[in-house]
Each structure stands twice: as structure tokens, then as C-alpha cells.
């Protein structure tokens, strides 16, 4: 799977994680930090 960094406009899209662009799927994806979940890594779980 080819990945690259998200466009500058997506800075801040992922609240607690890193935004990556999945080229083959044409999708932005939030890779969440440990302890966070949700489309935008907005939910904290224990």
C-alpha cells in the first residue's frame, strides 16, 4: 500500500494522531496515538 503525508489542509484533522494519505484507496486516514480511537482519533478509551 502506497502512503504519503496528508495535504496541508488536513493539519489538525486528526486530534490525537497522525494523518496519512492512502494513495491506492484515495483516503485520508488517522493513525491514532495509543489510547485514542474514532475517525479523527477524538475518543479516549482506557
Amino acid at each position: 500500500v502506497s502512503i504519503t503525508k496528508c495535504n496541508s489542509d488536513m493539519n489538525g484533522y486528526c486530534l490525537h494522531g497522525q494523518c496519512i494519505y492512502l494513495v491506492d484507496m484515495s483516503q485520508n486516514y488517522c493513525r491514532c496515538e495509543v489510547g485514542y480511537t474514532g475517525v479523527r482519533c477524538e475518543h479516549f478509551y482506557l
Epitope: N7, D9, G12, Y13, S26, Q27, N28, V39, R40, E42
Partner: antibody, heavy 116, light 106 residues
């Protein structure tokens, strides 16, 4: 099925304000950004601004700064674009556009006519 | 704001011709460019995103290329149904549309 359904056509007098709504179904607007784009008759496409409904953060094109207000009501899954001090040059079709995880998905457009 | 200079503003070509439209950005947009087709009375239709990724259902005669500040959109063999106005859109840093290219048949 994801959808963006915009409010109906409006006719306004110069100097008035207009508020266009954009109701999302099939997805949560908090997972997206909502952009607004307009197109005057016979003219090109013009980006106006956008909102991040989760953070409640907005960004506007410089030429619209102070005249446009983009808001979002996450309880009703609806975004709004209000344009004030209308002039005849604001006659256009106004589109809301979803961006975020997937690339852009457009609403059907709302015609706003400014005429005395 | 990033500026997008699209050329030509209009062109006339014969059925079967190769048609090329260019967009030049005022700064590097890191391949974050999309191309739209718009027919009269219709909303824009997304053809290509991320420079060269064709959307599902879009004919393979449409293609895109480029990097840095210079990008190209090509119709390899113009068909009557391709008569429309085409727009580039940079979405690296906020959004800016090119001025559009009206494609007509000779």
C-alpha cells in the same frame, strides 16, 4: 447512502443577508470538513471557506472575510453559510462540499438571486 | 493564498483529437490537484484527484500528470460527450480553482 441536502432557492434584496443550510445524512459531519463553493452565472467556481464542525474552527477566503459566516450544528448534522451585505454580484449557485476521509462530495446547490 | 493559472481558457478540437489543459500553481502543491468536468446546468463532476487517480466510472481517455507547480490534464481522444468546461482545483492548502477551460468541438 451519504447525502448533502441544501435549502431551497432564495431571492434577496441588495444589502440583505442570506443563510443557506446543508443537511448531511448517512455520515456524521464531525468526521468531516464542510466547504462552501459558489458559481455566478456563466462564471467559474470560487471557494469561499470551510468549517471543521468538531473543533468549530473556520477558514475563509480573504475576499469574503467579514461578510461570510460558516457555522455547524452537530446535533442536527447541518452546516450553514451566511453571507451579509448582499450585492448583485453575489447572485450565484452556492454549494456545500464534504471533505475529510474521502475526497469531495457535493450538495445539489442553492441558487441565491440578489435583485432590487 | 495559492493561485492556480489554468490555460487555455477555451479550445476547439475535432472528435478524436488529443486535448491538453494545464494548470500552474503559485507554489508547490505536492500533487494535491483534482480535475472537474462541468456541463451546463449541472454540478461539477470529479474526474481525477491526487494528480492522476481516476474516479470510478470515469473513462480511461481522461488522465492527469504533473508534480511541483505544473500539472496537465489530457483527453486522449475527444468524444462529443466531452464537451464541457474543465476546472483544476488545488487542495493542498485550503482550496483554489483554476479559471476553467471551455472545450468545444470544431
Amino acid at each position: 447512502q451519504d447525502q448533502l441536502v441544501q435549502s431551497g432557492a432564495e431571492v434577496k434584496k441588495p444589502g440583505a443577508s442570506v443563510k443557506v443550510s446543508c443537511k448531511a445524512s448517512g455520515f456524521n459531519i464531525k468526521d468531516t470538513y464542510i466547504q462552501w463553493v459558489r458559481q455566478a452565472p456563466g462564471q467559474g467556481l470560487e471557494w469561499m471557506g470551510r468549517i471543521d464542525p468538531l473543533r468549530r474552527q473556520t477558514k475563509y477566503r480573504e475576499k469574503f472575510e467579514g461578510r461570510v459566516t460558516i457555522t455547524a450544528d452537530t446535533s442536527t448534522n447541518t452546516a450553514y453559510m451566511e453571507l451579509s451585505s448582499l450585492r448583485s454580484e453575489d447572485t450565484a449557485v452556492y454549494y456545500c462540499v464534504r471533505s475529510g476521509r474521502e475526497f469531495d462530495y457535493w450538495g445539489q446547490g442553492t441558487l441565491v438571486t440578489v435583485s432590487s | 493564498d495559492i493561485q492556480m493559472t489554468q490555460s487555455p481558457s477555451s479550445l476547439s478540437a475535432s472528435v478524436g483529437d488529443r486535448v491538453t489543459i494545464t494548470c500552474k500553481a503559485s507554489q508547490d502543491i505536492h500533487k494535491y490537484i483534482a480535475w472537474y468536468q462541468q456541463k451546463p446546468g449541472q454540478a461539477p463532476r470529479l474526474l481525477i484527484q491526487y494528480t492522476s487517480t481516476l474516479q470510478p466510472g470515469v473513462p480511461s481517455r481522461f488522465s492527469g500528470s504533473g508534480s511541483g507547480t505544473d500539472y496537465t490534464f489530457t483527453i486522449s481522444s475527444l468524444q462529443p460527450e466531452d464537451i464541457a468546461t474543465y476546472y483544476c482545483l488545488q487542495y493542498d492548502n485550503l482550496r483554489t480553482f483554476g479559471g476553467g477551460t471551455k472545450v468545444e468541438i470544431k
